[in-house]
């Protein structure tokens, strides 16, 4: 296995996932494509935790670019051994991967809490509240209850879809960073095994 190529593949995947996380989080601010609910502060409290923008997004770009950089051939050797610098780089990528695990973990936790609590909406009794908070997430299994939210239109579908996407993306990011921890440790211990002749596709 070529540890550097694997890291680069993980890095590129994380960039894509991070951008999707940022997009999903931004969409949470505009239920049904409307801006007024953000300005009126009629959005779920978990939208304001920036889990997709920060946790699954910006914080994920740091490890992503570190992983991508591992494939470069300009790693400095040490004590006359070229592979020593690459080993150090692989081991340092473990630290970057741990930052990624923290970011994606934050994204997953906040998305799960957002799903469990449900949206802030104008209920059928004309009150703005966390209508489904008392259901402990069971509203997710009973779509006939979603009409209890009268405003914003389709807010339950909107929240459930986007928080589910954040949960899934964060979960994938978490797994990829976990893989890179293992990859980085193995790459650091076993050495940078790729010769210039070897070509591996991820």
């Amino acid at each position: 296995m070529c540890y550097g190529k694997c890291a680069r593949c993980i890095g590129h995947s994380l960039v894509g996932l991070a951008l999707l996380c940022i997009a999903a989080n931004i969409l949470l601010y505009f239920p049904n494509g409307e801006t007024k609910y953000a300005s009126e502060n009629h959005l779920s409290r978990f939208v304001w935790f920036f889990s997709g923008i920060v946790g699954g997004g910006l914080l994920m770009l740091l490890p992503a670019f570190v992983f991508i950089g591992l494939e470069q051939d300009d790693c400095c050797g040490c004590c006359g051994h070229e592979n020593c610098g690459k080993r150090c780089a692989m081991l340092s990528s473990v630290l970057a991967a741990l930052i990624g695990i923290a970011g994606s973990g934050y994204c997953v936790i906040v998305a799960a809490l957002g799903l469990a609590e449900g949206p802030l909406c104008l209920d059928s009794l004309g009150q703005w509240n966390y209508t489904f908070a008392s259901t402990e997430g069971q509203y997710l299994l009973d779509t006939s209850t979603w009409s209890e939210c009268t405003e914003p239109k389709h807010i339950v579908e909107w929240n459930v879809s986007l928080f589910s996407i954040l949960l899934a993306l964060g979960g994938i990011e978490f797994i990829l960073c976990l893989i890179q921890v293992i990859n980085g440790v193995l790459g650091g211990i076993c050495g940078f095994c790729c010769s210039h002749q070897q070509q591996y596709d991820c």
Epitope: S124, L125, G126, Q127, T145, T150, E151
Partner: antibody, heavy 116, light 107 residues
Framework: EVQVQQSGPELVKPGASVKMSCKAS????????MHWVKQKPGQGLEWIGY????????NYNEKFKGKASLTSDKSSNTVYMELSSLTSEDSAVYYC?????????WGQGTLVTVSA | DIQMTQSPASLSASVGETVTITCRTS??????LAWYHQKQGRSPRLLVS???TLAAGVPSRFSGSGSGTQFSLKINSLQPEDFGIYYC?????????FGGGTKLEIK
Amino acid sequence: EVQVQQSGPELVKPGASVKMSCKASGYTFTSYVMHWVKQKPGQGLEWIGYINPNNDNINYNEKFKGKASLTSDKSSNTVYMELSSLTSEDSAVYYCAGYGNSGANWGQGTLVTVSA
Amino acid sequence: DIQMTQSPASLSASVGETVTITCRTSKNIFNFLAWYHQKQGRSPRLLVSHTKTLAAGVPSRFSGSGSGTQFSLKINSLQPEDFGIYYCQHHYGTPWTFGGGTKLEIK
């Protein structure tokens, strides 16, 4: 003071349609959800549907789909319910109720009598 | 649709007494239950929403309790204006459904 005023009684022939109104006053109309409820003489309450005048979000009881049609006019703070293809089964008092920050405010009801 | 079963269908009580009306639902509605009072020839009036939240202007002698599928409305120290029909109603999604009513009469 919050008030919900409904239109007067209606005597209509079978097969005809009727449109009743419900005018709200004393509060921000668009911050309320307006519900319609049917009550046959001497019987219980039956929910027809709701309309949120702020975004025209409408939800009907499956039983009244095709029978009732809810609309709103923000300029006059009025919601309307039209009942079509009337039969004797539709003879009842129809209540309009506004639900919002000041609680629930029910109209006095509109009596609809379907008779040949 | 969620079925609402009220009991008793009717009861007689004297002014000053305490009465309890119960409501059972066909599925778990958590705390999404409301109570109404209707006098003869009048519109229903909301008393309680979300099981125990008293509506504006409702006297403290009224209290709601319960959760899941079993709910009750308790009226302490009955007053002459409390007589009439009481309805329970779920507001856990749509369609809203009402109980058959409990007729409270003066003994």
